[in-house]
Amino acid sequence: FKVATPYSLYVCPEGQNVTLTCRLLGPVDKGHDVTFYKTWYRSSRGEVQTCSERRPIRNLTFQDLHLHHGGHQAANTSHDLAQRHGLESASDHHGNFSITMRNLTLLDSGLYCCLVVEIRHHHSEHRVHGAMELQVQTGKDAPSNCVVYPSSSQESENITAHHHHHHH
């Protein structure tokens, strides 16, 4: 299997909510002996490998943000801990999984990584990750809503309809 990142760059104004997305691709074994551990973390573009370093997202580690289930089952983090930090990770039946970040600040800018670990009984684990950049902007040059740039081309897409401005 592989992990696809539909968008490689998200450009958002301060205060906006954004959902970063990854997609599990390829043959996914739905047998009882296979489960998937999915999580998110911040990283840096390392010289050797992107996403090798695991840093917290808003002080929450990848351990706090994980999802565990078999195949294309739906799941989400219901932890109060994540929600208190304005975060929620979720997964649907189609292999998509995401992390939603609310009320973005400039400190949220950086590289984000999704990680999938395939756990197959009595076999070695198979790890795959995807990377995407989040740029949070302020001032007159900031977009009014999040703009996303597809990984395959640099044609931008406005995602206003999906990510509403945060209200207190």
Epitope: Y37, S52, Q63, H68, V117, H121, H122, S124, R127
Partner: antibody, heavy 118, light 107 residues
Framework: QVQLVESGGGLVKPGGSLRLSCAAS????????MSWIRQAPGKGLEWVSY????????YYADSVKGRFTISRDNAKNSLYLQMNSLRAEDTAVYYC???????????WGRGTLVTVSS | EIVLTQSPATLSLSPGERATLSCRAS??????LAWYQQKPGQAPRLLIY???NRATGIPARFSGSGSGTDFTLTISSLEPEDFAVYYC?????????FGQGTKVEIK
């Protein structure tokens, strides 16, 4: 910060049994994949057994297979290791440790000493 | 099972010196290797994960390198609290295995 505390160690005769417990503080023990690791006096570390967060799969080192049984009770935030047919070579400090997928042993208890001697 | 061989068994150095510890795997473990530090009477502590990344709170004087079968842990300038036993561990395959350890002692 979550803590792991082992208990149940002690002196037992060869062929005897012992049940070790590992109590986890915090609300997310049901998210934890766990292992038992042991260390004989003055020796190195040896992985013993693993259990996933849901209780399956379970793995054992060849040296304890058929004699040791790992289990967990998520409602009680507890991990267990039932040790039967104990041998002198099982004498060690036994640690429980978090063992998340794609990760390493990042959270350890302080250990409990098991001594197998006549 | 994958056998991890650490060398040297003991390293005698003075504070401020550079320590270089080696771990060799009997077959490739990719970069799925960690280093732990253990002091007497304490549980091991994760230092380095995935061969080259420092765990949370680990000082910059600790660094890891390598992939495949050959790995190195380097302590750039030994502090008094660094004298301990160091273990490598792989998680590329079952069973999880550790090296036999390298003791870093004060010269």
């Amino acid at each position: 910060q979550v803590q792991l505390v082992e208990s149940g160690g002690g002196l037992v005769k060869p062929g005897g049994s012992l049940r070790l417990s590992c109590a986890a503080s915090g609300e997310t023990f049901s998210d934890y994949y766990m292992s038992w690791i042991r260390q004989a006096p003055g020796k190195g570390l040896e992985w013993v057994s693993y259990i996933s967060n849901s209780g399956s799969p379970i793995y054992y080192a060849d040296s304890v297979k058929g004699r040791f049984t790992i289990s967990r009770d998520n409602a009680k935030n507890s991990l267990y290791l039932q040790m039967n047919s104990l041998r002198a070579e099982d004498t060690a400090v036994y640690y429980c440790a978090r063992d998340l997928p794609g990760w390493y042993f990042d959270l350890w208890g302080r250990g409990t000493l098991v001594t197998v001697s006549s | 099972e994958i056998v991890l061989t650490q060398s040297p068994a003991t390293l005698s150095l003075s504070p401020g010196e550079r320590a270089t510890l080696s771990c060799r795997a009997s077959q490739s473990v990719s970069s799925y290797l960690a280093w732990y530090q253990q002091k007497p009477g304490q549980a091991p502590r994760l230092l380095i994960y995935d061969a080259s990344n420092r765990a949370t709170g680990i000082p910059a004087r600790f660094s890891g390198s390598g992939s495949g079968t050959d790995f190195t842990l380097t302590i750039s300038s030994l502090e008094p609290e660094d004298f301990a036993v160091y273990y490598c561990q792989q998680r590329n395959n079952w069973p999880r295995t550790f090296g036999q350890g390298t003791k870093v002692e004060i010269k």
